[in-house]
């Protein structure tokens, strides 16, 4: 079943290559287990950046080596992606799945364009 997912159109990463955006979903029911996946679309190719399953009211748990972290509040997830470089500029799509209890719902956002600028190298100090 389809579900509406909203996310901002554009976000700027900071000089350390960290970008954050909000992913909001219109939950049709009272889900207790939610899965959030971040996908990156570039040149018509879609790749998975990270994913986390969480129980409502608990923290999002990404894999230890994940570049993503996140927090949840109600039907809203705040996602942070770290270690981004200029080549990572692209459209980051939020996919939300309500895993439990049934029925299963899935929604995909329109995507957030994250702009990343590589920091200027520090000049050598004498």
């Amino acid at each position: 079943k389809a579900m509406h997912v909203a996310q901002p159109a554009v976000v700027l990463a900071n000089s350390r290559g960290t970008a954050s955006f909000v992913c909001e979903y219109a939950s049709p029911g009272k889900a207790t287990e939610v899965r959030v996946t971040v996908l990156r679309q570039a040149d018509s190719q879609v790749t998975e950046v990270c994913a986390a399953t969480y129980m409502m009211g608990n923290e999002l748990t990404f894999l230890d080596d994940s570049i993503c972290t996140g927090t949840s509040s109600g039907n809203q997830v705040n996602l942070t992606i770290q270690g981004l470089r200029a080549m990572d500029t692209g459209l980051y799509i939020c996919k939300v799945e309500l895993m439990y209890p049934p029925p299963y719902y899935m929604g995909i956002g329109n995507g957030t364009q994250i702009y990343v600028i590589d920091p200027e190298p520090c000049p050598d100090s004498d």
Epitope: P8, V10, F21, T89
Partner: antibody, heavy 115, light 110 residues
């Protein structure tokens, strides 16, 4: 519902500074970039710049670089635009706007620069 | 910096259909430019009609629709009404900044 409410009209002398506020409500303030747009009398819309309230990242249009500063107070969901070294051609209406998949505009703040 | 181009003025008869376009000096407009269409009437603040190519605001009448047409963003009004007479601006996103077009003055013939 989403609302952007701006501060009242200002009259300033050339060389002075002006600070306009924009109070946001009805959405996650830190989740969306806030833009500032100027409209001179009888003219079109001109993008001044934007701020990312979550991490305070700003990007200013080249024309305004060095004269404009954007700040936010996330505790009261308010964005600010300060324009310094005002000139008579800075006279106009200043709008805050959330430009997005669904966009919203403030009602505008008239800034008059006159000796 | 990119230049965004719009028709300076267009005229439509009541009940007629008109298409306003928004072009980019850098090439074809795509969904990555998140085309925004804004309506402004004299003495009023701008009001967003369409965001991100074709997402309507809750107050946007059904007769307005956004699309990409021949490398440009387009706003089509099907069945124009007298109250649609206004200035229409488009805004395009370029990686880290927005650029506004010069606006199209739409006249609805009385």
């Amino acid at each position: 519902q989403v609302q952007l409410v701006e501060s009242g009209a200002e009259v300033k002398k050339p060389g002075a500074s002006v600070k306009v506020s924009c109070k946001a409500s009805g959405y996650s303030f830190t989740g969306y970039t806030m833009n500032w747009v100027r409209q001179a009398p009888g003219q079109g819309l001109e993008w001044i710049g934007l701020i990312n309230p979550y991490n305070n990242i700003t990007n200013y249009a080249q024309k305004f670089q060095g004269r404009v500063t954007f700040t936010v107070d996330t505790s009261i969901s308010t964005a600010y635009m300060e324009l310094s070294r005002l000139r008579s051609d800075d006279t106009g209406v200043y709008f805050c706007a959330r430009l997005d998949y669904r966009s919203y505009w403030g009602q505008g703040t008239l800034v008059t620069v006159s000796a | 910096q990119a230049v965004v181009t719009q028709e300076p003025s267009l005229t439509v008869s009541p009940g007629g259909t008109v298409t306003l376009t928004c072009g980019s000096s850098t090439g074809a407009v795509t969904t990555s430019n998140f085309p925004n269409w804004v309506q402004q009437k004299p003495g009023q603040a701008p009001r967003s009609l369409i965001g991100g190519t074709n997402n309507k605001a809750s107050w946007t009448p059904a007769r307005f629709s956004g699309s990409l047409l021949g490398g440009k963003a387009a706003l089509t009004i099907s069945g124009a009404q007298p109250e649609d007479e206004a200035e229409y601006y488009c805004a395009l996103w370029y990686s880290n900044h927005w650029v506004f077009g010069g606006g199209t003055k739409l006249t609805v013939l009385r």
